[in-house]
Structure formats: structure tokens, C-alpha cells
């Protein structure tokens, strides 16, 4: 059974992940120059189901494509450091989902733009955090 300390640690990690995802989304949305619309041509894959920490496997598998899109953004004077940011997210995701059980991600038929993708995982984090508090 999870202890209060492990629950607290999970909550803090989720909050960190949430902040990172929100920072990327805000960076896209707040960047007034619509030159970044080219990022919207990239396709992201969404989980068929995302209700448990193990479903973060689906996010982990999309981190490399996310980094590639952010690299394009950076070349257009978008001030995020994609490699560092994605590396941080990857570490948190690996800790949260655990490596004890191998989970095969199932993807939904519908794909998403980077904005839709980030919003989906932000909602996931918020949902899990709310069950822990």
C-alpha cells in the first residue's frame, strides 16, 4: 500500500511534470508571433485511455517527437531549451510510471496537434493530482 510519504512524492513529481507541460504550452500560446503556426503541422498520438500513472508510457513514447517540434520552434527565436526540458520530463515520467511492469501503450485513432497533445497531458496530471489530495 502506498505510504503518505510516497503519495506526497508522487504528487510533487506530478506537479513538476504539470508545470513543465504548462510552461511549454504557455510558451507556444504566449509567443505572439504566429510564425510558430508551422508547429501545428506536426502530428501527435494520443492515448486511448489515460487514467493511471502507467499510462504515462504513452507520453514517454511521444517525447522525442515533442523535442523535434520544439527544436523547430527554437530556430524561430522561441526561448525554450528543448533538450534540457524534455530530458527533465523524461526523468519524471520514468519515475512516475515505474519500470516494474511493462505496459504497452494503446493509442486513439485520432491524432492531435502539439496544443491538443499538451492540453491532454496537462488534464491527465491535474486529474491524478486531484485524486491524491
Amino acid at each position: 500500500a502506498p505510504t503518505s510519504s510516497s503519495t506526497k512524492k508522487t504528487q510533487l513529481q506530478l506537479e513538476h511534470l504539470l508545470l513543465d507541460l504548462q510552461m511549454i504550452l504557455n510558451g507556444i500560446n504566449n509567443y505572439k508571433n504566429p510564425k510558430l503556426t508551422r508547429m501545428l503541422t506536426f502530428k501527435f498520438y494520443m492515448p486511448k485511455k489515460a487514467t493511471e500513472l502507467k499510462h504515462l508510457q504513452c507520453l514517454e513514447e511521444e517525447l522525442k517527437p515533442l523535442e523535434e517540434v520544439l527544436n523547430l520552434a527554437q530556430s524561430k527565436n522561441f526561448h525554450l531549451r528543448p533538450r534540457d526540458l524534455i530530458s527533465n520530463i523524461n526523468v519524471i515520467v520514468l519515475e512516475l510510471k515505474g519500470s516494474e511492469t511493462t505496459f504497452m501503450c494503446e493509442y486513439a485513432d485520432e491524432t492531435a496537434t502539439i496544443v491538443e497533445f499538451l492540453n491532454r497531458w496537462i488534464t491527465f496530471c491535474q486529474s491524478i493530482i486531484s485524486t491524491l489530495t
Epitope: 500560446n29 508571433n33 504566429p34 510564425k35 503556426t37 508551422r38 508547429m39 501545428l40 503541422t41 506536426f42 502530428k43 517527437p65 523535434e68 517540434v69 523547430l72 524561430k76 491524432t111 496537434t113 496544443v115 491538443e116 492540453n119
Partner: antibody, heavy 122, light 108 residues
Framework: EVQLVQSGAEVKKPGESLKISCKGS????????IGWVRQMPGKGLEWMGI????????TYSPSFQGQVTISADKSINTAYLQWSSLKASDTAMYYC???????????????WGQGTTVTVSS | SYELTQPPSVSVSPGQTARITCSGD??????AYWYQQKPGQAPMLVIY???ERPSGIPERFSGSSSGTTVTLTISGVQAEDEADYYC???????????FGGGTKLTVL
């Protein structure tokens, strides 16, 4: 009404220079990328390059890099495509088109000009 | 350079279903767009984001995607649908826009 209006047909001789135009109206011209597309007689569409009129940032297709120059004058909402020395093989229809977008979606080339016919012949 | 491959021609009888395919290595990661071009006219967007229809485009036009192939489907084809159809996407870096070679749809 959102529209792109292109300059009229041109007949030129090989070696001459040419600049054709594409004027946008009905939207914020500086906030949307404008692309140029070539269509040679009886052939398909070829993407030449694109410009962001807000700051004139430009990307060329590798096939057209160094062959043409894409520019824009945001004060008069107009994008340009120019040649310094025309060749017979430049004979084609040239279209300008706007890259449309929304808050979280990219609409592709959603508005097109009517096209400018360029004929290069001695 | 990156290429999108389309069949040169597709023929179909009125009322039947026409399917036009477009294949490219980057299509699993880049959205596709479809344009209709009738003789003497500028191209017109008929599908964006693989499967979305702009306002004013009839419901018989639909798009789908599977792996490295996207498909434009025209259900209950009408004589007025006879035209050239082009798919368009971007290379894997998102830097360059690319068109397919075009497909001539003939309504028999």
C-alpha cells in the same frame, strides 16, 4: 472578404527580369505566411517557398533556392516573386497562397490568388 | 528531396466512390492537406489535418490516414468532381512544403 489578388499576365524575353505581386486584403497580412506555387503547362503544383510578411523571414524550396527571390512589403500588404534573368523554362502559372491557422490548428493553404501567367519566349 | 506519391489517374462512374491515395515517409508525423483544381482555376482546399473538411466543402469529401499513406475519399461522385487532386504535406523537419504529383479524377 479574405482574398489575394495577383498582378496580371506577363510576356517576357529570356534574360529579362520580372517581379510579380500578390496583394492581401480582409485579414492581418503580417500575421500569415504567404507561399508561392509554380504550375508549368499541363503539370502539377510545385512549392517554391514561403515568406512571413511580418519580418520577411523566408524559406525556399531547395529546387528554387537561388533561382527566384521572394519578398514582401508589409506597408502595402503585398508579397512578391522575382527573377533577375528569366529562362524559357520559367514559363508557367504562378500562384500565391496563404497558410491558414487557428489557435490549435493549421489549415493548409486556405486562400489562393487567381494566378499570374508568365510566358518567356524569344 | 522529400516526395509524396499519388496515382496519376483514377476513373469512377457517377454515384460510385473514388479513393485517391498519397504516400510519403513523413506522413505518420506530418498532417496532410488535399486540394481540388479544375481546369483554368486556382487550387481549392478540400481537406485539412488529414480528415477535416473546410466549411462549404460537401460531406461526400473525406480524408483518412494510416501510417505512411493518406487517402482522399469522394463518396457518391458527381460529374462536377472531375478535376485534378493534389495532396500536400511537409518534410519530417516541418521546414519544406511538398505537393504530390497530382491525380486526375475522371468521372465516366
Amino acid at each position: 472578404e479574405v482574398q489575394l489578388v495577383q498582378s496580371g499576365a506577363e510576356v517576357k524575353k529570356p534574360g529579362e527580369s520580372l517581379k510579380i505581386s500578390c496583394k492581401g486584403s480582409g485579414y492581418s497580412f503580417t500575421s500569415y505566411w504567404i507561399g508561392w506555387v509554380r504550375q508549368m503547362p499541363g503539370k502539377g503544383l510545385e512549392w517554391m517557398g514561403i515568406i512571413y510578411p511580418g519580418d520577411s523571414d523566408t524559406t525556399y524550396s531547395p529546387s528554387f533556392q537561388g533561382q527566384v527571390t521572394i519578398s514582401a512589403d508589409k506597408s502595402i500588404n503585398t508579397a512578391y516573386l522575382q527573377w533577375s534573368s528569366l529562362k524559357a523554362s520559367d514559363t508557367a502559372m504562378y500562384y500565391c497562397a496563404r497558410e491558414g491557422f487557428g489557435e490549435s490548428i493549421h489549415y493548409g493553404l486556405d486562400v489562393w490568388g487567381q494566378g499570374t501567367t508568365v510566358t518567356v519566349s524569344s | 528531396s522529400y516526395e509524396l506519391t499519388q496515382p496519376p489517374s483514377v476513373s469512377v462512374s457517377p454515384g460510385q466512390t473514388a479513393r485517391i491515395t498519397c504516400s510519403g515517409d513523413a506522413l505518420p508525423r506530418q498532417y496532410a492537406y488535399w486540394y481540388q483544381q479544375k481546369p483554368g482555376q486556382a487550387p481549392m482546399l478540400v481537406i485539412y489535418k488529414d480528415s477535416e473538411r473546410p466549411s462549404g466543402i460537401p460531406e461526400r469529401f473525406s480524408g483518412s490516414s494510416s501510417g505512411t499513406t493518406v487517402t482522399l475519399t469522394i463518396s457518391g461522385v458527381q460529374a462536377e468532381d472531375e478535376a485534378d487532386y493534389y495532396c500536400q504535406s511537409a518534410d519530417s523537419s516541418g521546414t519544406y512544403v511538398v505537393f504530390g504529383g497530382g491525380t486526375k479524377l475522371t468521372v465516366l
